[in-house]
């Protein structure tokens, strides 16, 4: 390291420099009270004030005490360095509810997701656990830019026709052998058994597929109007993509969440 007796000829007899044998070059001699930031300083900016342990040099060139992580609920995230404070964070299993400079003023235990909810995002030192319903609903972005619950096809008489996507709802249709008696947005509110008809029989009820209508079953003993089975073998179902929410046993509320944010229900209600 710096030699007591620099080779004057090597450093041109300059008292502000010394010869360091280890790196074989002339180094700038930091003024008294200043300490080098590297083994062989080259200029005054390579020298700095040295602070006592547990102090750091702040932006104003002042020695400032590093924060302590001595509280039971805190752990050290980054150590005290010459130019930066120690940083404390809440210990595992806790999150910070009230932050403080380089530390946390109040730590709380992570919430446990209540019954019917599962962990969507585990708790961190900064954030509480984020919970979501254990089953559906899931969500899509509607035309208004709102996160909207996809319809559920969990009823026994429904099957999924198209899945829930980021920009479109799941669509449901009546399961084979059933026909939609009361249509609903992206689904069917009421499925009824498909009528048994002779081949080449009469026409379907007027505008059945186009409108949210209720098909009244004919009186007993009368022959209903029958449609030929569609070419793909599926019973007709309303899939008009109108942006209203399905109101059924699985209905879920629309959450006005920013489009970039993941949707989550916090167990703390926040």
């Amino acid at each position: 390291f710096p030699q007591d007796r620099p080779f004057e000829d090597t450093c041109h007899g300059n008292p502000s420099h010394y010869y360091d044998k280890a790196v074989r070059r002339c180094c700038y001699r930091c003024p008294m009270g200043l300490f080098p930031t590297q083994q062989c300083p080259q200029r005054p900016t390579d020298c700095r004030k040295q602070c006592e342990p547990d102090y750091y040099l702040d932006e104003a060139d002042r020695c400032t005490a590093c924060v302590t992580c001595s509280r039971d609920d805190l752990v050290e995230k980054t150590p005290c360095a010459w130019n930066s404070s120690r940083v404390c964070e809440c210990r595992p299993g806790m999150f910070c509810s009230t932050s403080a400079v380089n530390s946390c003023a109040r730590c709380f235990f992570h919430s446990v997701c209540p019954a019917g909810m599962i962990v969507k995002f585990p708790g961190t030192a900064q954030k509480n656990t984020v919970c979501e319903p254990a089953s559906e609903p899931d969500y899509y972005l509607d035309e208004a830019g709102r996160c909207t619950a996809c319809v559920s096809c969990s009823r026994d008489d429904l099957v999924e026709k198209t899945p829930c996507a980021w920009n479109s709802s799941r669509t449901c249709e009546c399961r084979p052998g059933m026909i939609c008696a009361t249509s609903a947005t992206n689904s069917c509110a009421r499925c009824v058994p498909y009528p048994i008809c002779a081949a080449e029989t009469v026409t379907k009820p007027q505008d059945m597929a186009e409108k949210d209508t209720t098909f009244e079953a004919p009186p007993l003993g009368t022959q209903p109007d029958c449609n030929p089975t569609p070419e793909n073998g599926e019973a007709p179902a309303s899939t008009s993509p109108t942006q209203s929410l399905l109101v059924d046993s699985q209905a879920s509320k629309t959450l006005p969440i920013p489009t970039s944010a993941p949707v989550a229900l916090s167990s703390t209600g926040k």
């Epitope: 710096p2 008294m32 009270g33 200043l34 006592e52």
Partner: antibody
Amino acid sequence: EVQLLESGGGLVQPGGSLRLSCAASGFTFSSYSMSWVRQAPGKGLEWVSGIGYPYYTYYADSVKGRFTISRDNSKNTLYLQMNSLRAEDTAVYYCARYYYDYGFDYWGQGTLVTVSS
Amino acid sequence: QSVLTQPPSASGTPGQRVTISCSGSSSNIGSNYVYWYQQLPGTAPKLLIYRNNQRPSGVPDRFSGSKSGTSASLAISGLRSEDEADYYCAAYRSYDYVFGGGTKLTVLG
């Protein structure tokens, strides 16, 4: 409490040698530059030598080549090896902590060095 | 011959304001902080003013320092008998530290 305690002073003949020590306590010794400042009887203060990190040394022209400053951080002790002593080196030698921007913020009580035949 | 020039003596009566001057050059006072030390009779020096005009904790606000160009001064207001001491100015200079010759302050009466 910061304390600096010098020792090693005494009477020595011209051309002789003496080694002063300064035991430091109450602060993190290795984090500070240290200095020796002397005061001849009835005279003013004169800075003699300083040591920084970890072996940077600084000397007044009047002692260059004759005095050597050193430190042992493990023992929290500062030393001044004085060789080829002269009558004009007679003085009370103070050990002082030097903190950049703050100057000599703590001083020892001093140890008297007398160079006389 | 000291690098920094101070008047050898100064005096004042209790309650008075006294100023001690310190003159240097561009290589010391002109480009660095000025420090003032007080040395009471028979004791080690004590830091009185650092960074031209800052007082360490415990130093009364009767003591104040100032610097202008290559000169500095120490002012003591409300002079007290216990202020009788030697006062030294000092400054860093490239790779050494220089003191003034010292000013002996006498409190009269």
